[in-house]
């Protein structure tokens, strides 16, 4: 007569994380007498997966009815599979012994591979803002995927980037893997509305890659350009001086007017106008009563943008040609919060 064989027909089984794995096993005979048990791994360190007699195995169910007579189907199902369940599973026939059962024959084993989706990529940029023409680094991380093969791409506004380095860890066998990539991006003045995208493609995603994004508005600082101009005379003894603050980002900006080096007024940018490229413009003006001055006045527009060192632009106001008017030292004209009379 033929000796009992333990048949595991599937050399490998591939299951998506969260699903149920079916591990098939049949015996060719009911004898010798003794139980079947399931293990993960071989040798002394193997892990008991299912023993019908003893233990609590809440995720394991038998394929065949436990009350079925003369059952030779010892297949099991393992529910809610995670990457940690990956490994080779053995269906093992024991011969009844006293006091302990003795291993009689093992199946060839079924390798369970778990397909686990990568987590949503998280893209992070530099801690501090940088100005155009500078190169900044972005990192992208995704975790928990299996198998190890994965593809990562970087894009800036839909254009694929080439300057990046990617690592998948660990290097050896593992239940799941992580990917880490660093891309270098050169900033331009037009990048306020730009996006950097990290795209991850994996077999579990069925051709629909995961994307993580970073807005360059969180990274870029576009310093302003300043222009101070003298407007046509509004009244015979008044001059309007404007400071145009153009193309700056972010909005955080403080402007100080200096008259011959002395602080005249400080204000914070509020009602700014936004340009198409996402940068801002702002204008401040100063109403100067030239009749109060005997000498030329040096007006300076000083701007502190986003906590950076101040930049300034000066304008020399000529006053010699203006005759002094009666009472002008008492009746100053104020036409707005951004105006200033000089006596």
């Amino acid at each position: 007569e033929e000796e009992l064989q333990v048949i595991q027909p599937d050399k490998s089984v591939l299951v998506a994380a969260g699903e149920t794995a079916t591990l098939r096993c049949t015996a060719t005979s009911l004898i010798p007498v003794g139980p079947i048990q399931w293990f993960r791994g071989a040798g002394p360190g193997r892990e008991l997966i299912y023993n019908q007699k003893e233990g609590h195995f809440p995720r394991v169910t038998t394929v065949s009815d436990l009350t079925k007579r003369n059952n030779m189907d010892f297949s099991i199902r393992i529910g809610n599979i995670t990457p940690a369940d990956a490994g080779t599973y053995y269906c093992v026939k024991f011969r009844k012994g006293s006091p302990d059962d003795v291993e009689f024959k093992s199946g060839a084993g079924t390798e369970l591979s778990v397909r686990a989706k990568p987590s949503a990529p998280v893209v992070s940029g530099p801690a501090a803002r940088a100005t155009p023409q500078h190169t900044v680094s972005f990192t992208c991380e995704s975790h928990g995927f299996s198998p190890r093969d994965i593809t990562l791409k970087w894009f800036k506004n839909g254009n694929e980037l080439s300057d990046f380095q990617t690592n998948v860890d660990p290097v050896g066998e593992s239940v799941s893997y992580s990917i880490h990539s660093t891309a270098k991006v050169v900033l331009t003045r037009e990048d306020v509305h730009s996006q950097v995208i990290c795209e991850v493609a994996h077999v579990t995603l069925q051709g629909d890659p995961l994307r993580g994004t970073a807005n360059l508005s969180e990274t870029i600082r576009v310093p302003p350009t300043l222009e101070v101009t003298q407007q046509p005379v509004r009244a015979e003894n008044q001059v309007n001086v404007t400071c145009q603050v153009r193309k700056f980002y972010p909005q955080r900006l403080q402007l100080t007017w200096l008259e011959n080096g002395n602080v005249s007024r400080t204000e914070t940018a509020s009602t700014v106008t936004e340009n198409k490229d996402g940068t801002y413009n702002w204008m401040s003006w100063l109403l100067v009563n030239v009749s109060a001055h005997r000498d030329d006045v040096k007006l300076t527009c000083q701007v502190e943008h986003d906590g950076q060192p101040a930049v300034s632009k000066s304008h020399d106001l000529k006053v010699s040609a203006h005759p002094k008017e009666q009472g002008s030292n008492t009746a100053a004209e104020n036409t707005g919060s951004n105006e200033r009379n000089i006596y």
Epitope: S29, P32, V33, L66, N70, K96, S98
Partner: antibody, heavy 119, light 108 residues
Framework: VQLVESGGGVVQPGGSLRLSCAAS????????MTWVRQAPGEGLEWVST??????YYADSVKGRFTISRDNSKNTLYLQMNSLRAEDTAVYYC???????????????WGLGTRVTVSS | EIVLTQSPATLSVSPGERATFSCRAS??????LAWYQQRPGQAPRLLIY???IRETGIPERFSGSGSGTEFTLTITSLQSEDFAVYYC??????????FGGGTKVEIK
């Protein structure tokens, strides 16, 4: 399924007997087989079970009784040596049925053969 | 060894009445318990296995219940052929297979 025991009789203490059980109606070589005995006026007592090469005995008969099978003849045997008065009983041959992946109960029984150990 | 204790030892019941008797195991045997009927002068006959599964051909009036250490065999309406001795047997932990001492159901 039919199980027919034979070989019982009267034997003196210390003597030997060989019981046989002829099986038919099922695939004999695929199943474990068991001997169960019942002393006069008493309950059932498991004696021995055989699988393929694996054999199991009650402590009360270990070393004295030997269970065996001949699959080519569809026959189960129980060789009983060093018989004692307390071995007096009706000996039943039973076919094992397995459930729960490892447990055995007895779904078919023979009519039994009587063994009397007496001087 | 697992000891099975059956009670009562004898049960006197009138035909048509309900008979219930128990089998208590000295340790947990899960559902690995069988019941047998033995009529006078006959071989035992399997009635129930896995604590509650009726063997093919066994009338519906026989039912098994329980798990762990407490088991019950119930005959809902006793017929004349049901007067016999009933044995329980555990197959959870063996050798040895063990039988209870039996419950004799006799006519009242």
């Amino acid at each position: 399924v039919q199980l027919v025991e034979s070989g019982g009789g009267v034997v003196q203490p210390g003597g030997s007997l060989r019981l046989s059980c002829a099986a038919s109606g099922f695939s004999f070589s695929n199943f474990a087989m068991t001997w169960v005995r019942q002393a006069p006026g008493e309950g059932l007592e498991w004696v021995s079970t055989i699988g393929s090469g694996d054999t199991y005995y009650a402590d009360s008969v270990k070393g004295r009784f030997t269970i065996s099978r001949d699959n080519s003849k569809n026959t189960l045997y129980l060789q009983m040596n060093s018989l004692r008065a307390e071995d007096t009983a009706v000996y039943y041959c039973a076919k094992d049925s397995t459930v729960s992946w490892s447990g055995d109960f007895f779904d078919y029984w023979g009519l039994g053969t009587r063994v009397t150990v007496s001087s | 060894e697992i000891v099975l204790t059956q009670s009562p030892a004898t049960l006197s019941v009138s035909p048509g009445e309900r008979a219930t008797f128990s089998c208590r195991a000295s340790q947990n045997v899960k559902n690995d318990l069988a019941w047998y009927q033995q009529r006078p002068g006959q071989a035992p006959r399997l009635l129930i296995y896995a604590a509650r599964i009726r063997e093919t051909g066994i009338p519906e009036r026989f039912s098994g219940s329980g798990s762990g250490t407490e088991f019950t065999l119930t005959i809902t309406s006793l017929q004349s052929e049901d007067f016999a001795v009933y044995y329980c047997q555990q197959y959870y932990d063996w050798p040895p297979f063990t039988f209870g001492g039996g419950t004799k159901v006799e006519i009242k």
